[in-house]
């Protein structure tokens, strides 16, 4: 009876999310493998988040709006492990917007989700950021490693969206 009611709850939750995400990919998690954590298909998952790489070339503001429509934000990178996971799926000759910007050009960088900007957990390429007119951050491959660079916000780039996993 308990399992039956849990399944019914899951199905109703799935139906609720289906109006936003036509397809979800779920895995069993938790102590007793009773919880399901899901990401929209074809997003990838790492720890408690889902990631989507958009190959559409758009400005930073349009890229953020695009993520927002999908219930996400441009990616906020919190650890080296997270960055290493993300970069496995990126093309080395491309650049991708991050959810990091400095709109006033005062070198006060801020994450889109209001996560505090911690200078000790940043992965800027050597010599970056280097221009107060370049107010948005990308991740790209340079000098044999992935790192961040400041660029003009209006210049179209690819982007990475991030959202919390859906638990059902």
């Amino acid at each position: 009876n308990f399992m039956y009611s849990k399944t019914v709850k899951r199905l109703s939750k799935l139906q609720e999310y289906q109006q936003y995400y036509p397809s979800l990919t779920c895995v069993m998690e938790g102590k007793d493998m009773e919880d399901w954590s899901c990401c929209p298909t074809p997003w990838t998952s790492f720890q408690s988040s889902c990631y989507f790489i958009s190959t559409v070339m758009q400005s930073w503001t349009k890229s953020q709006n695009n993520c927002s429509v999908m219930g996400a934000d441009l990616v906020v990178i919190n650890t080296k492990e997270e960055q290493d996971f993300i970069t496995q799926n990126l093309k080395i000759n491309s650049a991708y917007f991050l959810g990091l910007s400095d709109p006033k050009g005062w070198r006060h960088w801020q994450w889109v989700d209001q996560t505090p900007y911690n200078k000790n957990v940043t992965f800027w390429h050597s010599g970056e950021p280097n221009s107060p007119d370049e107010r948005c951050a990308i991740i790209n491959f340079r000098s044999e490693e992935w790192g961040w660079n400041d660029v003009h916000c209006h210049v179209p780039q690819k982007s990475i969206c991030k959202m919390k996993k859906i638990y059902i």
Epitope: W60, T61, S101, G105
Partner: antibody, heavy 121, light 111 residues
């Protein structure tokens, strides 16, 4: 006092070439993105090209892509527009303009007086 | 490309009256509290001159009778009160995404 002075315009036949120059003074030229904007006789403003302060980034509309090249020489405080394969529809006054960044975009705070390009046989 | 549509194409205003010009963008040119529309004045035989940046900020040296407002896709330039020297073409411009684009212009004549 900020000054932008364009030169190099003139009468040219279709298919011909011209090189426009913009001499900048009164500000630190190397710190600013610059653009060319044109205005056909009796018409509105049309952006033609942009170059970033360190010239790492250039951008053109489809109407001039492959025919026009923007460049700059920060040592000479000069902006250039090389125009090849000119067409009658390129006839216009060409202005150089300084870009000022504002949040996620930019605007043009100073404009030169313009130089006239006429493409006609 | 973002298309900017200005209206009216022309208007005639008596000195001391209010002139209102609108600019509609084909998609939003705002992001959160940043409204990224700018306005220029161009008098005959002269280059354009910046009036308003960021939808509502008056450029230094521009008379306070000029004001701007708006967000997202709808923006307004107001001249109040209009003076004889305000005879000119007025253009809106955005550059939130390349390519930067201008509105088609509004011709303001003083009666």
């Amino acid at each position: 006092e900020v000054q932008l002075v364009e030169s190099g315009g003139g009468l040219v036949k279709p298919g011909g070439s011209l090189r426009l120059s913009c001499a900048a003074s009164g500000f630190t030229f190397s710190s600013y993105g610059m653009s060319w904007v044109r205005q056909a006789p009796g018409k509105g403003l049309e952006w033609v090209s942009t170059i970033s302060s360190g010239d790492s980034y250039t951008y053109y509309p489809d109407s001039v892509k492959g025919r026009f090249t923007i460049s700059r020489d920060n040592a000479k405080n000069s902006l250039y527009l090389q125009m090849n394969s000119l067409r009658a529809e390129d006839t216009a006054v060409y202005y150089c303009a300084r870009q000022i960044y504002y949040d996620y975009a930019y605007y043009f705070d100073f404009w030169g007086q313009g130089t006239t390009v006429t493409v006609s046989s | 490309d973002i298309v900017l549509t200005q209206s009216p194409a022309s208007l005639a205003v008596s000195p001391g009256q209010r002139a209102t010009i609108t600019c509609r963008a084909s998609e939003s040119v705002s992001f959160r509290t940043s409204h990224l529309m700018h306005w220029y004045q161009q008098k005959p035989g002269q280059p354009p001159k910046l009036l308003i940046y960021g939808a509502s900020n008056l450029e230094s040296g521009v008379p306070a009778r000029f004001s701007g407002s708006g967000s997202e896709t709808d923006f307004t330039l107001t001249i109040n009160p209009v003076e004889a020297e305000d005879t000119a073409n007025y253009y809106c411009q955005q550059s939130i995404e390349d390519p930067p684009t201008f509105g088609g212009g509004t011709k303001v004549e003083i009666k």
